[in-house]
């Protein structure tokens, strides 16, 4: 009887407690997934913080689905990662897939859910700390001692496949110091540290981080005692500094001493040449003399050498980055208009100093940055408004109407490259000197083309030879041009009608003014800045201004000879008016045929360079 009463009392009490306690409870609080990490992109673990338990036993479960899927999955492993965690093994881990996960907390009063967390394994990588951290004090002879630190990447990381790129960071501090000194080591697994305090005991640690992801924990600290006799032997350093200082001083003194003289003359004194005028282009072909001279403060003045007047006979055609021949009508850019280069309308092109034989450099040999395009960010632009109308100035047509000029606001005229026929070779700019030389001799017509800035001076008044026509020359030519807003915006390829030309004093270079169908070039000598007064185009000194292309030398130099038949023709504008085209053409053909035959016999081989014997020239001309 007593037992029944006792058990009934206990039962009632438990029932009361259960009822009362359950009444006072709440559903669980909201859990939070606070971290997901992968040590190696192959597995990952997520951890959550439980919310309040509501005073009741609460169960937690993690559910997830992959982006694009609706099927929910439950966490595969609640054990491996410890309490309140979910571990995803290899078979559950997919790269480049987003996992959408949520933790569910449930008790007798209800269920609560964490916010959804979006996880991409690529971005949650946190490697294990680096291993086998070794620290050593190295004290080489005659050099400052240093701390040498070496380590290995964490074992789970596969670095060989390129799947991973690990970056490392080292920190060290004297044992009793508060502040850590941090060094970034990049991808290397060893590091040298100088400037240590002798007699101190240092703590060294290393950690790593993948390209996307988090820094690992610091590796266990390694201790190293820095010896007290950790002295510096700076002899080598001082010797190096002294030598370097001496060299710098010598260079400065040398530069100052040579100021005002031609640097080139000092470095490469004039060597007596062969009988006729010519120069060895291979002499400076391999040296970057131009860069050296400008670095030392030497200006690009024309050299005062024995070769001052060579360019009257030898016209050098270069294909440096500063000079381009353009074919507007290419396959890539059909009928694309071109914006003129903004050059100062000055008649001095500056090519004499840039390309004089004494200053010939590697520049001509350098490959083009972009072989298929005319590269100048400010020069070529696709027209914003293709409908824009362009006006032609009727007075600006010369050369028998074949080369149109565009009006530049005043009476000045400038040439612009003509669009090529559609069957033309699609290259939009030439990059081969030999091709150009062939073109010059070849029968094809040659409209003028624009040259870019060369060296410091803009190329302001010159004209180069057009690239070859491979098919038949097309009769119709399509022309596009732009109306320049100011005179300054106009590139001057040809001088104005009334522009005076230089006297027959020693010349630096010549300017091409016309290319006939036969390849005859009209040349005008360019006057040096310090020369005397200019002479009018009609003067007798200008008689030798017309020349024929006689041949192309192996080193890509055009050989030009004076044309005796064109003696009374003063300038290209006047020649177009006065001389009948047929007569001029006839004379040109005869002279060219006569000279070409002779010149082949008169060629001498001198150290890989072709020279032409002037004696032969005179015979052929007589």
């Amino acid at each position: 009887m007593k037992e029944n009463v006792a058990s009934a009392t206990v039962f009632t009490l438990l029932l009361f407690l259960n009822t009362c306690l359950l009444n006072g409870q709440l559903p669980p609080g909201k859990p939070e997934i606070f971290k997901c990490r992968s040590p190696n992109k192959e597995t990952f673990t997520c951890w959550w913080r439980p919310g309040t338990d509501g005073g009741l036993p609460t169960n937690y479960s993690l559910t997830y689905h992959r982006e694009g899927e609706t099927l929910m999955h439950e966490c595969p492993d609640y054990i491996t990662g410890g309490p309140n965690s979910c571990h995803f093994g290899k078979q559950y881990t997919s790269m480049w897939r987003t996992y959408i996960m949520m933790v569910n907390a449930t008790n007798q009063m209800g269920s609560s859910f964490s916010d959804e967390l979006y996880v991409d394994v690529t971005y949650i990588v946190q490697p294990d700390p680096p291993l086998e951290l070794a620290v050593e004090v190295k004290q080489p002879e005659d050099r400052k001692p240093y701390l040498w630190i070496k380590w290995s990447p964490p074992t789970l990381i596969d670095l060989k496949t390129g799947w991973f790129t690990l970056l490392y960071e080292i920190r060290l501090k004297p044992e009793k110091a508060a502040e850590w000194e941090i060094h970034f080591a990049g991808q290397q697994t060893e590091f040298k540290i100088l400037s240590l305090h002798p007699g101190q005991k240092y703590l060294v640690q290393v950690r790593c981080k993948p390209d996307h992801g988090y820094w690992s924990a610091w590796s266990p600290a390694t201790f190293i005692q820095i010896p007290s006799d950790f002295t510096m032997n700076d002899t080598t350093v001082w010797i190096s500094v002294a030598v370097l200082s001496a060299v710098i001083c010598l260079i400065i003194v040398w530069a100052v001493a040579l100021k005002g003289y031609s640097m080139v003359t000092c470095i490469f004194p004039p060597v007596p040449g062969p009988k006729i005028k010519g120069f060895d282009a291979h002499l400076l072909e391999k040296g970057k003399s131009e860069e050296l001279l400008s670095a030392l403060g030497c200006q690009d003045f024309p050299p005062t050498s024995d070769y001052e007047d060579l360019l009257v006979e030898y016209l050098e055609v270069d294909d440096s980055e500063d000079q381009h021949l353009m074919s507007v009508h290419s396959k890539e850019h059909p009928s694309q208009g071109m914006k003129p280069t903004y050059l100062d309308p000055d008649t001095d092109s500056g090519r004499g100093s840039c390309d004089s034989p004494s200053l010939l450099s590697e520049k001509c040999e350098e490959p083009q940055a972009n072989p298929s395009t005319f590269y100048d960010p400010e020069v070529i632009e696709k027209p914003e408004n293709p409908e824009t109308t362009h006006t032609w100035d009727p007075q600006c047509i010369s050369m028998e109407g074949k080369i149109p000029y565009f009006h530049a606001g005043g009476s000045k005229c400038s040439t612009w490259p003509l669009p090529q026929p559609s069957q033309h070779n699609p290259r939009s700019s030439y990059h081969n000197i030999t091709d150009v030389c062939e073109l010059a001799v070849g029968p094809a017509g040659a409209p003028a083309t624009l040259l870019n800035e060369a060296g410091k001076d803009a190329l302001k008044s010159s004209q180069t030879i057009k690239s070859r026509e491979e098919g038949k020359a097309t009769q119709q030519r399509e022309v596009e041009s732009f109306h320049s807003e100011t005179d300054q915006d106009t590139p001057w390829l040809l001088p104005q009608e009334k522009t005076p030309f230089g006297s027959a004093k020693p010349l630096d270079y010549v300017e091409i003014h016309k290319v006939n169908k036969d390849g005859a070039l009209s040349l005008l000598p360019k006057q040096r800045e310090n020369s005397g007064k200019p002479k009018k185009p009609g003067t007798p000194e200008n008689n030798k201004e017309y020349a024929k292309v006689s041949g192309v030398m192996d080193n890509n130099i055009l050989v030009l000879v004076p044309d005796p038949h064109a003696k009374n023709v003063a300038c290209f504008e006047e020649s177009a008016k006065e001389a009948p085209p047929s007569l001029e053409q006839n004379q040109a053909e005869k002279a060219l045929a006569n000279f070409t035959a002779t010149s082949s016999k008169c060629r001498l081989q001198l150290g890989g360079l072709d020279y032409l014997d002037p004696a032969c020239f005179t015979h052929s001309f007589h």
Partner: antibody, heavy 116, light 110 residues
């Protein structure tokens, strides 16, 4: 008889504070979780806050988090709601309600009106 | 804006059966039990149904509740004029860590 009686409502300026009280009788107050629920004029019911039987767990609606504090004094069988930084949208009839073991509000007070 | 959706109004003639729906989502109705409250004009709310379909003592058996997935419904059969009131569904929302009430449904007995 099981009963809940609210007090402390009134007119208050925006940004002001007010403390509501709910006196419980007719049941073991310390064994139940207690709630505050409000109802704006002409609108529906909105749960405000809950406190567990011993005061260890408290949950708040997002709209009042950081401004309102729920508390209880089991020795006085009283539930409190401290309202700070009051806004016009807090204007409502405030009810205290008991939470039963099924997670339902089984006993409700008659409410106290708060006008901001 | 309530996380639980109820129709703003419902109506019926005496003796008729009326159903009020309440739809939610997985974090509330989908994973927790639904309660229904009745609020007569000018009075405090009163528990009508708890744990989806349980009636507290004193509530007539004309009131019944049900739940399916993320939706719940309250059915009133044999409609009477005293049933004219506002009805609310409520559930613990695990995402909000709090109780969510539906927007009120005003029942009119024609």
């Amino acid at each position: 008889e099981v009963q809940l009686l609210e007090s402390g409502g009134g007119l208050v300026q925006p940004g002001g504070s007010l403390r509501l009280s709910c006196a419980a009788s007719g049941f073991t107050f310390s064994s139940y979780s207690m709630n505050w629920v409000r109802q704006a004029p002409g609108k529906g019911l909105e749960w405000v806050a809950v406190i567990s039987y011993d005061g260890s767990n408290k949950y708040y609606a997002d709209s009042v988090k950081g401004r309102f504090t729920i508390s209880r004094d089991n020795s006085k069988n009283t539930l409190y709601l401290q309202m700070n930084s009051l806004r016009a949208e807090d204007t409502a009839m405030y009810y205290c309600a008991r939470l039963n073991r099924a997670g339902a509000f089984d006993i409700w007070g008659q409410g106290t009106l708060v006008t901001v | 804006q309530s996380v639980l959706t109820q129709p703003p109004s419902a109506s019926g003639t005496p003796g008729q059966r009326v159903t009020i729906s309440c739809s939610g989502r997985s974090s509330n109705i989908g994973s927790n039990t639904v309660n229904w409250y009745q609020q007569l004009p000018g009075t405090a709310p009163k528990l009508l149904i708890y744990k989806n379909n349980q009636r507290p003592s004193g509530v007539p058996d004309r009131f019944s509740g049900s739940k399916s997935g993320t939706s719940a419904s309250l059915a009133i059969s044999g409609l009477r004029s005293e049933d004219e009131a506002d009805y609310y569904c409520a559930v613990w929302d695990g995402s909000l860590s709090g109780w969510a009430f539906g927007g009120r449904t005003k029942l009119t007995v024609l």
